[in-house]
């Protein structure tokens, strides 16, 4: 039950995280005009990964896409790449994890297969989250560098008579969305990996064979120490419908064609 809950929660957390990464990538407010010195402005600038926008105090907003690929800063291209890789990995991870969910039955898929898929999706979520966090952090670093550079030469002009106010940019909402979303995807991935450990049948998946001795009804299960001492993934004698590994009581109660009497 705990495994299913962990896996389900991991899936949901990752789903929210990836939705957040997609939202952050599409958002226009990666960097916003710094309003520290002038909280009320007639022209407000903000920029995203794909376009820059200007909101006038009149209420009109004008957005212009970056219609060049080669003319864009390498860092911006890198951030775009990281976010897209994060989204793609996350999307594939979600697809894989849907089939890996313990609560979803697909044919006669074995637990080992589900465990492998859970681990795969978990790793994908972790990498996806790291990509998003890295992308957002690279952009944030770029902003900080540019902020202090523009602060250093805030006003430029001839003899101080004519002033050109350089627009400074600070962190936009998308950065915080990206950081949180990346973190959630990462946490979801870790939860999936933890769930994988609980899903994986830890003993070798041989058919259980019961030997009916004359006096006692004892089932011998190959698998060594873990099987005999009650450790491993199936200590609660749960029914596992996978056609192979069975619990001791199940083998005893329901003799099948695999039993040798």
């Amino acid at each position: 039950m705990a495994v299913t809950a962990c896996q389900g929660l991991g899936f949901v957390v990752s789903l929210i995280g990836i939705a957040g990464i997609i939202a952050a990538t599409c958002m226009d407010q990666w960097s916003t005009q710094d309003l520290y010195n002038n909280p009320v402005t007639a022209v407000f600038n903000y920029q995203g990964l794909w376009r820059s926008c200007v909101r006038e105090s009149s209420g009109f907003t004008e957005c212009r896409g970056y219609f060049t690929l080669l003319g864009l800063p390498a860092m911006l291209q890198a951030v775009r790449a990281l976010m897209i890789v994060g989204i793609v990995l996350g999307a594939i991870g979600l697809l894989v994890s849907i089939f890996a969910l313990k609560c979803i039955r697909i044919g006669s898929m074995e637990d080992s297969a589900k465990a492998n898929m859970t681990l795969t999706s978990g790793i994908m979520f972790i990498v996806s989250g790291l990509c998003a966090i890295a992308g957002v952090s690279v952009f944030a670093n770029m902003l900080v560098t540019n902020f202090w550079m523009s602060t250093a030469n805030m006003y430029t002009g001839m003899g101080g008579m004519v002033q050109t106010v350089q627009t400074r940019y600070t962190f936009g909402a998308a950065l915080f969305v990206g950081w949180v979303a990346g973190g959630l995807t990462l946490i979801g991935g870790v939860m999936m990996c933890i769930a994988c450990r609980g899903l994986a049948p830890e003993e070798t998946n041989y058919k259980a064979v019961s030997y009916h001795a004359s006096g006692h009804s004892v089932a011998y299960k190959p698998g060594g120490f873990k099987a005999s001492t009650g450790f491993g993934s199936n200590t609660k004698n749960k029914k596992i419908y996978d056609g192979g590994a069975r619990t001791e009581d199940e083998v005893q109660s329901y003799p099948s064609k695999h039993d040798y009497v």
């Epitope: 007639a42 022209v43 009149s58 209420g59 002033q163 050109t164």
Partner: antibody, heavy 118, light 113 residues
Framework: EIQLQQSGAELVKPGASVKISCKAS????????MNWVRQSHGKSLEWIGN????????TYNHKFKGKATLTVDKSSSTAYMQLISLTSEDSAVYYC???????????WGQGTLVTVSA | DIVMTQSPSSLTVTAGEKVTMSCKSS????????????LTWYQQKPGQPPKLLLY???TRESGVPDRFTGSGSGTDFTLTISSVQAEDLAVYYC?????????FGSGTKLEIK
């Protein structure tokens, strides 16, 4: 057709206050800020401030803070400007104007003449 | 506050002539975000409210004759009337629309001979 209809001329005594109205029609009143501009006789134009009718939040020219108070009544699509502690310096034509692209003022009221005289 | 300086304060021309008037701002009105200059030109005829001619320094408002053209960037702007008509007799104002408080120039009075 967008129209801004201002209240009639006012003759007031020094130290008194006056409230000018500007009724908007032909557009959704809450969509655009309303600006107020002053023009003293034979002089240039001075921007007093503007108000966002949706939130009722004003922005003032620091020169007119404490002199002008901007308000709106959404139900009647009317903007108001109250001027207090009037002096002869405040005698002018007061215009309301709404916003357009580029923060320009494409539509203007006909103006309200305020005369401050003892 | 941004100071807007217009010149000349008045000019007298004959109908059909080309006329130019200047407007200078104490700070750049060019917004880096969209590369637009937040300068507006108005025409005010006697006894009337101002009428919007051009915004973003050079974009003509609808209904404005194409003889009115605006140019310039940053701090220096020009309004040109290619062929002055009798109905162009008015005072022309430039306005800073870039930062609060919005400020107007002192105006250029256009008179027809």
């Amino acid at each position: 057709e967008i129209q801004l209809q201002q209240s009639g001329a006012e003759l007031v005594k020094p130290g008194a206050s006056v409230k000018i109205s500007c009724k908007a029609s032909g557009y959704s009143f809450t969509d655009y800020h309303m600006n107020w501009v002053r023009q003293s006789h034979g002089k240039s134009l001075e921007w007093i401030g503007n108000i966002d009718p949706y939130y009722g939040s004003p922005t003032y020219n620091h020169k007119f803070k404490g002199k002008a108070t901007l308000t709106v009544d959404k139900s009647s699509s009317t903007a108001y400007m109250q001027l207090i502690s009037l002096t002869s310096e405040d005698s002018a034509v007061y215009y309301c104007a709404n916003y357009g692209r580029g923060n320009s003022f494409p539509y203007w009221g006909q103006g309200t003449l305020v005369t401050v005289s003892a | 506050d941004i100071v807007m300086t217009q010149s000349p304060s008045s000019l007298t021309v004959t109908a059909g002539e080309k006329v130019t008037m200047s407007c200078k701002s104490s700070q750049s009105l060019l917004n880096s975000g969209n590369q637009r200059n937040y300068l507006t030109w108005y025409q005010q005829k006697p006894g009337q409210p101002p009428k919007l001619l051009l915004y973003w320094a050079s974009t003509r408002e609808s209904g404005v004759p194409d003889r009115f053209t605006g140019s310039g960037s940053g701090t220096d702007f020009t309004l040109t009337i290619s062929s002055v008509q009798a109905e162009d007799l008015a005072v022309y104002y430039c306005q800073n629309d870039y930062s609060f408080p919005f400020t107007f120039g002192s105006g250029t009075k256009l008179e027809i001979k």
